[in-house]
């Protein structure tokens, strides 16, 4: 499956939409910065096989999709941009799922590298907890938007894994 190209294109589109979603000046939110600890060290030190990369990317996109599909998220962002962003993520999830079937066959279960998936889930739990603690304030959402943009850009090693032949 030609995932690297389509994923890269959709990823760029999602990032552009995310960049456009800002509603307030981020300069007013400096004091709300927070350490979410994206597990980049774990990712950087690992050579991902294609199926592993797909499963971890799927988890990241699924968690992002869930985060931006909440009622609180709907209240925070401009509706049409949010819908476009969610659609872009949904398409990415479909692409990844189709690729998994193609890579490992319908009967097989992909190697679910639990440690990495757990690290991604914990990372998103920290984001959700932060939003709750900040009572879903506009600045909290701004900080989260910046963080998600950063984590999307960070998944370089995962993307390298997509180009690898298992």
């Amino acid at each position: 499956c030609d995932l690297p190209q389509t994923h890269s294109l959709r990823n760029r589109r999602a990032l552009i939409l995310l960049a456009q979603m800002g509603r307030i000046s981020p300069f007013s939110c400096l004091k709300d910065r927070h350490e979410f600890r994206f597990p980049e060290e774990e990712f950087d030190g690992h050579q991902f096989q294609k199926t592993q990369a797909i499963s971890v990317l799927h988890e990241m996109i699924q968690q992002t999709f869930n985060l931006f599909s909440t009622e609180d998220s709907s209240a925070a962002w401009e509706q049409s941009l949010l819908e476009k962003f969610s659609t872009e993520l949904y398409q990415q999830l479909n692409d990844l799922e189709a690729c998994v079937i193609q890579e490992v066959g319908v009967e097989e279960t992909p190697l679910m590298n639990e440690d990495f998936i757990l690290a991604v889930r914990k990372y998103f739990q920290r984001i959700t907890l932060y939003l709750m603690e900040k009572k879903y304030s506009p600045c909290a959402w701004e900080v989260v938007r910046a963080e998600i943009m950063r984590s999307f850009s960070f998944s370089t090693n995962l993307k390298k894994g997509l180009r690898r032949k298992d």
């Epitope: 300069f27 400096l30 709300d32 910065r33 350490e35 963080e147």
Partner: antibody, heavy 121, light 107 residues
Framework: EVQLVQSGAEVKKPGESLKISCKGS????????IGWVRQMPGKGLEWMGI????????AYSPSFQGQVTISADKSISTAYLQWSSLKASDTAMYYC??????????????WGQGTLVTVSS | DIQMTQSPSSLSASVGDRVTITCRAS??????LNWYQQKPGKAPKLLIY???SLQSGVPSRFSGSGSGTDFTLTISSLQPEDFATYYC?????????FGQGTKVEIK
């Protein structure tokens, strides 16, 4: 390799205008803010203002608001600092530096080499 | 604006000495404090960010501590290349502000 390269030294007369530049390379230019810092001869560092190159949103120190204009052209990964009418007191070294924005990452981790501006009649 | 006050403004020390520079903020800034080193004719260099995180490539003899209003930069064993001016800077809120600097000179 991340680099911020600033334009060369300038010698100007009072009342003249000036625009100095800071070109970023080796990283995603729109993912970081660019700040400007002044250092007058023999003095300390003073933060002037900052720009988000992704949308050209700016914030200024009250001391510099209305005195300078910060802008950026993301198509060429360059930020600018400009004066419409220079004064002798603008004589200083000016630095640009990148800032991670709202991300939890090192502030001003890379700096330009500085642009020396001399204003004298 | 948040005022940043450094002390001392200058100090003389010998190679191998333990050096401590303090920085006080006029209001609580949590841990949003950075330390920079500047040598004559050079751009500042980031040493410590968020009060205690060592910037990549900076020797481990440099360390930072503190939170709220009081912060410290420590050089555990001063080296010849450490003679410079050190600045603290708050990154808690705009306008960003620097301390006035501490010049570390050879005794």
């Amino acid at each position: 390799e991340v680099q911020l390269v600033q334009s060369g030294a300038e010698v100007k007369k009072p009342g003249e205008s000036l625009k100095i530049s800071c070109k970023g390379s080796g990283y995603s230019f729109t993912s970081y803010w660019i700040g400007w810092v002044r250092q007058m001869p023999g003095k300390g560092l003073e933060w002037m203002g900052i720009i988000d190159p992704s949308d050209s949103d700016t914030a200024y120190s009250p001391s510099f608001q209305g005195q300078v204009t910060i802008s950026a052209d993301k198509s060429i990964s360059t930020a600018y600092l400009q004066w419409s009418s220079l004064k002798a007191s603008d004589t200083a070294m000016y630095y640009c530096a990148r800032h991670p924005g709202l991300n939890w990452a090192p502030d001003f981790d890379y700096w330009g080499q500085g642009t020396l501006v001399t204003v004298s009649s | 604006d948040i005022q940043m006050t450094q002390s001392p403004s200058s100090l003389s020390a010998s190679v191998g000495d333990r050096v401590t520079i303090t920085c006080r903020a006029s209001q609580s800034i949590d841990r949003a404090l950075n330390w920079y080193q500047q040598k004559p004719g050079k751009a500042p260099k980031l040493l410590i960010y968020f009060a205690s995180s060592l910037q990549s490539g900076v020797p481990s003899r440099f360390s930072g501590s503190g939170s709220g209003t009081d912060f410290t930069l420590t050089i555990s064993s001063l080296q010849p290349e450490d003679f410079a001016t050190y600045y603290c800077q708050q990154s808690f809120d705009f306008p960003l502000t620097f301390g006035q600097g501490t010049k570390v000179e050879i005794k």
